[in-house]
């Protein structure tokens, strides 16, 4: 004959476990239900009364399957260098990404705790590590015989035209300039761009327990003057 | 554009009820909650209470709690508030206004308001 | 339920002065849920200020809002014609929610 089916709550046999979607309550000493992801416990089991579970107040959540008494707290709205990849809603805290243009400046467990903006290399410097979604922009000097004139974040030095007859010799900011109707060789016009990152990881501010009782952190970290990288601007 | 079309002016005598109605239009998110907002005269603003119109679920500040039901209908998108056992103190100006799931509350569209006057 | 007290009541001030308002909470907010919003006589109220410190669009850069745990403030850095209204700072920490009692600006 199958073994009977329990529901809940019901007192486990000695030494096993309770099934999926259930918990041991050490009040009740008996198997109890969770909730269900966007929903957290409103009473606690008792031996005769399973657990009641209610829906997740405005601007919190809970993902998973749980007991817990409250929901966890959305994390703040993005800030205005941020885009919201995800809603806050009843299963799901709020997302939020890094614009365009700019990378995760501080890092936590899961996402992005500030962003800034990617670097940008100043004419006679190129771009010799394209910025990411976690990483910035690193500059470096245009090599002899090469040329950057632009203020950028993605731009790196390109070679000077090779002239029959030079006119003005080119330098790290400035390309050369032939006297020649035609130069011998050239780069194609316009500036060479490097791909910009595209911000796809999750970013999304670590919950507070209780949105009741626990005020929410604002992270409001020093940007005080600090010396620019070399070959950068903060433009 | 995003709209919260309240319904107009009443004068109603003291005991009467009375049933007004507010249609929202231009919104694409459904996961929102529709507020109703009291002002008396000169007065402050005081929250009535609030329904999830995608569940029917309500919040009332206690003191509202048998004098205000609050319903709505999801085909219309319309949220009602119907106010009962009238006196002369819920003579007011009755405004709804939506706040988005998230955002902790920030009412950020109101209606126009409608103006109750109790009086026999 | 958590009362919001605003300070002052009704204040004057004149074109380009700095303007500071304060509602102070009777047990403690988080930051995210406490907001601010504009009413002029005949109008709906306005959302003004969301989450202690951010601006709606539309709203001027003038505005700003600071503020944790019980206390919290509006302040406007120069102060302008339209900016005469009053203003109500409302709580949705725990419910019931509750409006401060407003502060009416008034042009000096």
């Known amino acids: 004959l199958p073994a009977q089916v329990a529901f809940t709550p019901y007192a486990p046999e000695p030494g096993s476990t309770c099934r999926l979607r259930e918990y041991y309550d050490q009040t009740a000493q008996m198997c109890c239900s969770k909730c269900s992801p966007g929903q957290h416990a409103k009473v606690f089991c008792t031996k005769t009364s399973d657990t009641v579970c209610d829906s997740c107040e405005d601007s919190t959540y809970t993902q998973l399957w749980n007991w817990v008494p409250e929901c966890l707290s959305c994390g703040s709205r993005c800030s205005s260098d941020q885009v919201e990849t995800q809603a806050c809603t009843r299963e799901q805290n709020r997302i939020c990404t890094c614009r365009p243009g700019w990378y995760c400046a501080l890092s936590k467990q899961e996402g992005c705790r500030l962003c800034a903006p990617l670097r940008k290399c100043r004419p006679g410097f190129g771009v010799a590590r394209p910025g990411t979604e976690t990483s910035d922009v690193v500059c470096k000097p245009c090599a002899p015989g090469t040329f950057s004139n632009t203020t950028s974040s993605t731009d790196i030095c390109r070679p000077h035209q090779i002239c029959n007859v030079v006119a003005i010799p080119g330098n790290a900011s400035m390309d050369a300039v032939c006297t020649s109707t035609s130069p011998t060789r050239s780069m194609a016009p316009g500036a060479v761009h490097l791909p910009q990152p595209v911000s796809t990881r999750s970013q999304h501010t670590q919950p507070t327990p209780e949105p009741s009782t626990a005020p929410s952190t604002s992270f409001l970290l020093p940007m005080g003057p600090s010396p620019p990288a070399e070959g950068s601007t903060g433009d | 554009e995003v709209q919260l079309q309240e319904s107009g002016p009443e004068i109603v005598k003291p005991g009467a009820s009375v049933k007004l109605s507010c249609t929202a239009s231009?919104?694409?998110?459904?996961?929102?909650?529709m507020h109703w907002v009291k002002q008396r005269p000169e007065q402050g603003l005081e929250w009535i209470g609030r329904?999830?119109?995608?569940?029917?679920?309500?919040k009332h500040d206690p003191k509202f709690q048998d004098k205000a039901t609050l319903s709505s209908d999801t085909s219309s998108n319309t949220a009602y508030l119907q106010f009962s056992s009238l006196t002369s103190e819920d003579t007011a100006v009755y405004y709804c206004a939506h706040s988005p799931y998230g955002d902790f509350g920030a009412m950020d569209y109101w209606g126009q308001g409608t103006t109750v006057t109790v009086s026999s | 339920d958590i009362q919001m007290t605003q300070s002052p009541a009704i204040m004057s001030a004149s074109l380009g002065e700095r303007v500071t308002m304060t509602c102070t909470a009777s047990?403690?907010?988080?930051?995210?849920?406490l907001h601010w919003y504009q009413q002029k006589p005949g109008s709906s109220p306005k959302l003004w200020i969301y989450?202690?410190?951010n601006l709606p669009s539309g709203v001027p850069a003038r505005f700003s809002g600071s503020g944790s745990g019980t206390s919290y403030s509006l302040t406007i850095s120069s102060m302008e014609a339209e900016d005469a209204a009053t203003y109500y700072c409302h709580q949705y920490h725990r419910s019931p929610w509750t409006f401060g009692g407003g502060t009416k600006l008034e042009i000096k």
């Open positions: 989450s202690t410190s």
């Open positions: 231009g919104f694409n998110n459904k996961d929102i909650y």
């Open positions: 047990s403690s907010v988080s930051s995210n849920y």
């Open positions: 329904i999830d119109p995608a569940t029917g679920n309500t």
